[in-house]
Interface confidence: medium
Amino acid sequence: MMTGTIETTGNISAEKGGSIILQCHLSSTTAQVTQVNWEQQDQLLAICNADLGWHISPSFKDRVAPGPGLGLTLQSLTVNDTGEYFCIYHTYPDGTYTGRIFLEVLESSVAEHGARFQIP
């Protein structure tokens, strides 16, 4: 039975050209996290695997940085980065947990800052 829950940064916004941290946290389970996938629509941004370590998708390697922790830092944001992001936790023995984050990248120099995981 899957008892865990994923807490995410939820809906967040950031300025064009800036950086943002995508962060998820799995709680309420003793399951072992074997891999975390970070995905955007149909593209894999990165994986963090207990054995393989971090691996950043080549098309994102210039502006995606691993961490902090199991999170992911997106840099040099563009308006095209607006959209849904998923953290997919592969765990044993529970199975797969998925969290959703919606990122809005704003042209304005006054972006709403509400997420506690955000880079100032």
Partner: antibody, heavy 120, light 113 residues
Amino acid sequence: QVQLQQSGAELVRPGTSVKVSCKASGYDFTDYLIEWVKQRPGQGLEWIGVINPGSGGTKYNEKFKGKATLTADKSSSTAYMQLSSLTSDDSAVYFCARYHYYGSNLFPYWGQGTLVTVSA
Amino acid sequence: DIVMTQSPSSLSVSAGEKVTMSCKSSQSLLNSGNQKNYLAWYQQKPGQPPKLLIYGASTRESGVPDRFTGSGSGTDFTLTISSVQAEDLAVYYCQNYHSYPFTFGSGTKLEVK
């Protein structure tokens, strides 16, 4: 263009070891993970494991732990798989394949395969 | 480990006919969070490495003819070839890439009469 060039066929004695190589070209070797897959004559495909050439981290199918050892040499852009304590069950074609990123772990670039025959 | 079961093990059809083959997984390959099925189909011709046809259960890989269609969700998947051509002679494998170890079905061998 992307190429994975595998070493030639091997005829080896039972109880010995063999090392199969997979030389990558046409892309940055550390950008993609390398998978290894086994195919016995006239049989299906078995996933052996994966290596992250950037970190050297490995993940194995439990079935092949102790049988296969995956390594990578960044300087020559070559991945290796060593098979030990060979028996007739190890007679097979072994493929290396490069990870593919469409939000998934797939293998669109494959080596041509290396036939390993174990015979006294 | 996730077990992938393919059927039939072989089939023989005439050129131009429609063919369907099945793949069933022992666990769901659907990630309910992002609504993706982590299921791929490969084609392997004699003496060649496998070639990726379909990923995400239904998305054709670039360059794959549109006569190849993948469908299904969860644990039941189908590969359909709408009008079989002589060059489609091959073994077709489904693959779980939902969780390690990645596992393949035993294959469906397609013969063209």
